[in-house]
């Protein structure tokens, strides 16, 4: 969380943002709020980036003002119009791209004052990992799937019950490169797995954290999974 | 200290070509947006090109849009300005420099010294 | 393209006088404007950032203001050294602009 002050005259006012990750060709979110304004038409919301001269997104007089936008975010940026009057500055960001990783600024300027907060917006890929028994392999295997990830992770096994026992020995991870040549498709096998036993595969790396837990007893198999971006922490 | 030194001015005959380049030293380099500016004899400042920090845009003035191309080599630490076509107007003192802080609403904090490009036959 | 105007185009005046510049925008540049001194042969010096914030290292007598389109440089006590020309700028749009400048001359 970062809370950025800015003086216009006497006057500042209060931008808050929150650091966040985009995953690449997917949608995102670059968070901003502020002390709102009465009027809309008193309401300026710029987003600026690290180093790019053109604005990332302008607001003002209660709609998109783009005649300043940089061309690399051109037909990508929106803000939550209906939202502006009660604070909301974020910026919704079409299709991320790798290149849109960086600082960002949220500048604010009403009736009231002016104010700015910036944010660290962190581009990759991740996905959340399934896990599945592998009744093709000669011993009992299971197979950990994860279909976009990038910057290559790290994939460790753990299981509930040998706790801290180290796997890397009896598991195998491969990351094969997608069609559009950025992303991988990540699978890991473990070997020799027992039942009546939870493992966990654990794929990470510096944007996100994704587990895919699998039960397997004699009777049934019980699957969980859950992912959780690591830089949308306040700082 | 922060430095930008700029080489590779000269004579050169109208239709020729000219690199320039602008060596930095003591700042990071690939976080800052550079520019050239120029400035003819006896005249004002008039803002010529500029280079995102990581080099993905570029901006350029409409009087060389089409002639001049601005590069960065952040392996070099160095900016490069290549002008083709040259015209007696581009005649000029070029100088290069870095834009304030971190985003595209601040001014010029540091400059070179210039370089001189007479463009005559 | 933004057009930035500067007036005067040349002043006199004494040491110790109260100086003051103005640059207007063709169009509103809220805060993204800058004011540079210029010595002949040297190159440009940055004064003041968004419009009213002074540079490290420049002296106090040395202020902005102004937001939207209209801008002033104010020089509150004219020193020797600061008989130069002086230049607005706007970053708010490629293409950047600069005023025709203002030379500051001794009466």
């Known amino acids: 969380l970062i809370i950025g002050f800015g003086i216009s005259g006497r006057h500042s006012i209060t931008v808050t943002t929150v650091a966040s990750a985009g995953n690449i060709g997917e949608d995102g979110i670059l968070s901003c709020t502020f002390e709102p304004d009465i009027k809309l038409s008193d309401i300026v919301i710029q987003w600026l980036k690290e180093g790019v001269l053109g604005l990332v997104h302008e607001f003002k007089e209660g709609k998109d003002e783009l005649s300043e936008q940089d061309e690399m975010f051109r037909g990508r940026t929106a803000v939550f119009a209906d939202q502006v009057i009660v604070g909301n500055a974020s910026l919704r960001l079409k299709n991320v791209q790798l290149t849109d990783a960086g600082t960002y600024k949220c500048y604010i300027i009403t009736s009231k004052g002016k104010g700015n907060a910036n944010l660290e917006y962190k581009t990759g890929a991740f996905s959340m990992p399934e896990v599945n028994v592998d009744y093709n392999a000669s011993s009992e295997t299971l197979r950990c799937e994860a279909p976009r990830w990038f910057p290559q992770p790290t994939v460790v096994w753990a299981s509930q019950v040998d706790q801290g026992a180290n796997f890397s020995e009896v598991s195998n991870t491969s990351f094969e490169l997608n069609s559009e040549n950025v992303t991988m498709k990540v699978v890991s096998v473990l070997y020799n797995v027992t039942i009546n036993n939870t493992y966990s595969c654990m794929i990470e790396n510096d944007i996100a954290k994704a587990t895919g837990d699998i039960k397997v007893t004699e009777s049934e198999i019980k699957r969980r999974s859950h992912l959780q971006l690591l830089n949308s922490k306040a700082s | 200290e922060v430095q930008l030194l700029e080489s590779g001015g000269g004579l050169v005959q109208p239709g020729g070509s000219l690199r320039l380049s602008c060596a930095a030293s003591?700042?990071?380099?690939?976080?800052?947006?550079m520019h050239w500016v120029r400035q003819a004899p006896g005249k004002g400042l008039e803002w010529v090109s500029a280079?995102?920090?990581?080099?993905?845009?570029?901006y350029y003035a409409d009087s060389v849009k089409g002639r001049f191309t601005i590069s960065r080599d952040i392996s070099k630490n160095t900016l490069y300005l290549q002008m083709n076509s040259l015209r007696a107007e581009d005649t000029a003192v070029y100088y290069c420099?870095?834009?304030?802080?971190?985003?595209?609403?601040?001014?010029?904090?540091?400059w070179g010294q210039g370089t001189t490009v007479t463009v005559s036959s | 393209d933004i057009q930035m105007t500067q007036s005067p185009s040349s002043l006199s005046a004494s040491v110790g006088d109260r100086v003051t510049i103005t640059c207007r925008a063709s169009?509103?540049?809220?805060?993204?404007l800058a004011w540079y001194q210029q010595k002949p042969g040297k190159a440009p010096k940055l004064l003041i950032y968004?419009?009213?914030t002074l540079q490290s290292g420049v002296p106090s007598r040395f202020s902005g203001s102004g937001s939207g389109t209209d801008f002033t440089l104010t020089i509150s006590s004219l020193q020797p050294e600061d008989f130069a020309t002086y230049y607005c700028?706007?970053?708010?749009?490629?293409?950047?602009?600069f005023g025709g400048g203002t030379k500051v001359e001794i009466k």
């Open positions: 169009r509103s540049i809220y805060t993204w």
């Open positions: 280079i995102s920090g990581s080099g993905g845009s570029t």
């Open positions: 420099a870095r834009l304030l802080g971190r985003f595209g609403e601040y001014g010029m904090d540091v």
């Open positions: 003591g700042f990071t380099f690939n976080t800052h947006a």
């Open positions: 700028q706007q970053s708010y749009s490629t293409p950047y602009t």
């Open positions: 968004d419009a009213s």
